[in-house]
């Protein structure tokens, strides 16, 4: 499965759209998880509404929001107020019972805001309304990875 690379600016929002076959995934909830390394387990961040018919409603966990357009076959995840620690490897998943099918692997890179320097001071209100999807460069990642990954915050 190819990995989509998305870039977002620190302090701003990043919108991730994962498309899927609406018929094949009919009735299934979707989830967004963070991999603890390229081959490590995927730690659930947020999932869509427990009632599939209400999947269009936004579900939030901290600064991450998910909503699913089940007719169009698009699940949208918004990472608000990006921080350096948000960089990493994520997955869009389709849930079927205890099983999770990977819809898309997403590598999120967080770029430093060139305007957010010392002169701006510490009190800086992020532009949460904006979204930056960057260049969606597709590439395959097939690197060897260490087998054990420490927990993430």
């Amino acid at each position: 499965l190819n990995t989509t690379v998305l870039q977002g600016m620190a302090g701003q929002s990043l919108r991730v759209s994962c498309t899927y076959d609406a018929l094949k995934h009919w009735g299934r909830r979707k989830a967004w998880c963070r991999q603890l390394g390229e081959e490590g387990p995927c730690q659930r961040v947020v999932s869509t509404h427990g009632v599939w018919l209400l999947a269009f409603l936004k579900k939030r966990n901290g600064s991450t929001v998910i909503a699913d357009d089940t007719l169009a076959g698009t699940v949208t995840i918004t990472l608000k107020n990006l921080q350096a620690g948000d960089a990493g490897l994520y997955q869009c998943q389709s849930l079927r019972g205890r099983e999770a099918e990977v819809l898309q692997k997403v590598l999120v890179e967080v770029l430093e805001d060139p305007l957010d320097d010392q002169d701006a001071g510490d009190l800086w209100v992020p532009e949460e309304s904006s979204s930056f999807e960057g260049a969606q460069v597709e590439h395959s990642t097939s690197r060897n990875q260490e087998t054990s990954f420490p927990p993430t915050s």
């Epitope: 620690g85 690197r143 993430t152 915050s153």
Partner: antibody, heavy 122, light 107 residues
Framework: QVQLVQSGAEVKKPGSSVKVSCKAS????????ISWVRQAPGQGLEWMGG????????NYAQKFQGRVTITADESTSTAYMELSSLRSEDTAVYYC???????????????WGQGTLVTVSS | EIVLTQSPATLSLSPGERATLSCRAS??????LAWYQQKPGQAPRLLIY???NRATGIPARFSGSGSGTDFTLTISSLEPEDFAVYYC?????????FGGGTKVEIK
């Protein structure tokens, strides 16, 4: 076991540049943050900047912006730190350090190089 | 940038005593905080990451606590080899600043 081996000590003239290398072995390289930290004689630790090789984009402390360049070569698992326009106050031990977890959220420095002493003197 | 203030600058204690080191951030760093120990002529050594997780091989007498802006490193009973300089570091956002350090010296 991950090991970071740095290049040897350097003596430089004011105004010149220095490039320090840091070769990683015994573990993967691409998604782990490599940070550069310096320590002037008798002083504390100072974070200069860092890079995640898979991204290739470095981040720098404002103090060093424009004078420091951090790069990484995935093919040789080597990171580099180049500091230009050297002055006497840049005399310090320069360390490279690799995160214990992946990406920036895991950039707590679990593995450290042995340090490279850079002396700037006319 | 986020400023980390460590206190006290110097802590004079005897072996067997309890050491409590403080690190205060100028703004929240969540739990993205690490503690390091450094001895003269050596590279720093990671003790604690993510505010409270002990690194592999670090004795149980070392513990970290706190979140947000206030953090503490506790050494429950000082051993002779624990006398060193201790630094905290945040890695929530760039630049990943260090505190000024706390020197734990023998009384």
């Amino acid at each position: 076991q991950v090991q970071l081996v740095q290049s040897g000590a350097e003596v430089k003239k004011p105004g010149s540049s220095v490039k320090v290398s840091c070769k990683a072995s015994g573990g993967t390289f691409s998604s782990y943050a490599i940070s550069w930290v310096r320590q002037a004689p008798g002083q504390g630790l100072e974070w200069m900047g860092g890079i995640i090789p898979i991204f290739g984009t470095a981040n720098y402390a404002q103090k060093f912006q424009g004078r420091v360049t951090i790069t990484a070569d995935e093919s040789t698992s080597t990171a580099y730190m180049e500091l230009s326009s050297l002055r006497s106050e840049d005399t310090a031990v320069y360390y490279c350090a690799r995160g214990g977890g992946t990406f920036w959220s895991g950039s707590w420095a679990l593995y450290w190089g042995q340090g490279t002493l850079v002396t700037v003197s006319s | 940038e986020i400023v980390l203030t460590q206190s006290p600058a110097t802590l004079s204690l005897s072996p067997g005593e309890r050491a409590t080191l403080s690190c205060r951030a100028s703004q929240s760093v969540s739990s993205y905080l690490a503690w390091y120990q450094q001895k003269p002529g050596q590279a720093p050594r990671l003790l604690i990451y993510d505010a409270s997780n002990r690194a592999t091989g670090i004795p149980a007498r070392f513990s970290g606590s706190g979140s947000g802006t206030d953090f503490t490193l506790t050494i429950s009973s000082l051993e002779p080899e624990d006398f060193a300089v201790y630094y905290c570091q945040q890695y929530v956002n760039w630049p990943f600043t260090f505190g000024g350090g706390t020197k734990v010296e023998i009384k």
